[in-house]
């Protein structure tokens, strides 16, 4: 398999740069940013005329143990009377990020990177419709 | 850190937590899926809050290209198809986690770091401030 | 309450430079498709630059490019157009506002950019 791009740059590798082993790279995990925040607008999941709820996954061996995923409350959006119009759609928007994911072989642990897909969201949109001949 | 339950029969580690610096496989899991958004759906532009991408590119960082949405209109798209400003289109944001060269430039040192990026809009109706 | 405001316009020479700002309140410009626009007498209101676009890319109209650059601070909202290498074709009133809205309720007052020797 290629070593994908994350270990290719085309920058001149600095003295500076830590030894390590062939096919692994070094991962620092405290991570820069911890303390932001999110400034969302307040409560939009429910202010949305395609309103979500949010479940939280959690497992152990991962890194964030925490990952929120949306769903779609409708597969309609609300409309100006608070029904659900069927006409249009509520679809999920979604947004790849990154985890450390922990494995254990008997008393040895290694570490994964893997890229996960997070439903952020629902954004209400125009059904494409399929004219059948 | 966080907390992860060990096998007890395993020799002690320097720290009981996630351990602060790793070594991990070059192989990133589910590295192909797409990351281009205009090419797994056409949203941006169907959405009654339909929203605009921005190309941030930084070598620095992997991945280098993270696409951000920037909301078209203040107001969201009425059935007629004209902006309705009683509705407000607003971004949906979301924190990830991104690799950051540390040292810069080195092709196999990172650091976790955590970005907040829009990644598209949702037509929502306003909060009314009443003025007593 | 939505309200932009520009400022930077000027008399300059032909070849100077100006930069326009425009300073946003009520939302956070750092969320929207936001764009300069201009208008010279007589002539249809133009879009000349937008942060973004549906292929991600700037937008530049071609009588502009490579001479103007658009920019946004997201601590201080607000969003500039560096302007090099003036003509005097680019006499104008400059606005700015979110690139698709045409609503001119939420369109400031504009700055005006003079181009002549």
């Known amino acids: 398999r290629k070593i994908p791009k994350v270990g290719h740059t085309f920058f001149q590798k600095p003295e500076s740069c830590p030894p390590v082993p062939g096919g692994s790279m070094k991962l620092d995990i405290g991570i820069i940013n911890e303390n932001q925040r999110v400034s969302m607008s307040r409560n939009i999941e429910s202010r949305s005329t395609s309103p979500w709820n949010y479940t939280v996954t959690w497992d152990p061996n991962r890194y964030p143990s925490e990952v929120v995923q949306a769903q779609c409350r409708n597969l309609g959006c609300i409309n100006a009377q608070g029904k659900e119009d069927i006409s249009m759609n509520s679809v999920p928007i979604q947004q790849e990020t990154l985890v450390v994911r922990r494995k254990h072989q008997g008393c040895s642990v290694s570490f994964q990177l893997e890229k996960v897909l997070v439903t952020v969201g629902c954004t209400c949109v125009t059904p494409v419709i399929h004219h059948v001949q | 850190g966080i907390t992860i339950p060990r096998n007890p029969g395993c020799p002690n580690s320097e720290d009981k937590n996630f351990p602060r610096t790793v070594m991990v496989n070059l192989n990133i899991h589910n590295r192909n899926t797409n990351t281009n958004p205009k090419r797994s759906s056409d949203y941006y532009n169907r959405s009654t809050s339909p929203w605009n991408l921005h190309r941030n590119e930084d070598p620095e960082r992997y991945p280098s290209v993270i696409w951000e949405a920037k909301c078209r209109h203040l107001g969201c798209i009425n059935a007629d198809g004209n902006v309705d400003y009683h509705m407000n289109s607003v971004p949906i944001q979301q924190e990830i986690l991104v690799l950051r060269r540390e040292p810069p430039h080195c092709p196999n040192s990172f650091r976790l770091e955590k970005i907040l990026v829009s990644v598209g809009c949702t037509c929502v109706t306003p909060i009314v401030h009443h003025v007593a | 309450e939505v309200q932009l405001v520009e400022s930077g316009g000027g008399l300059v020479q032909p070849g100077g430079s100006l930069r326009l700002s425009c300073a946003a309140s009520g939302f956070t410009l750092g969320y929207y498709a936001i764009g300069w626009f201009r208008q010279a007498p007589g002539k249809e209101r133009e879009g000349v630059s937008c942060?973004?676009?549906?292929?991600?890319?700037?937008y530049y109209a071609n009588s502009v490019k490579g001479r103007f650059t658009i920019s946004t601070d997201n601590g201080k909202n607000t969003v500039y157009l560096q302007m090099n290498s003036l003509k005097p074709e680019d006499t104008a009133v400059y606005y700015c506002?979110?690139?698709?809205?045409?609503?001119?309720?939420?369109w400031g007052q504009g700055t005006q950019v003079t181009v002549s020797s």
């Open positions: 942060d973004s676009s549906s292929d991600g890319d700037t």
């Open positions: 506002a979110t690139c698709t809205d045409w609503n001119y309720d939420y």
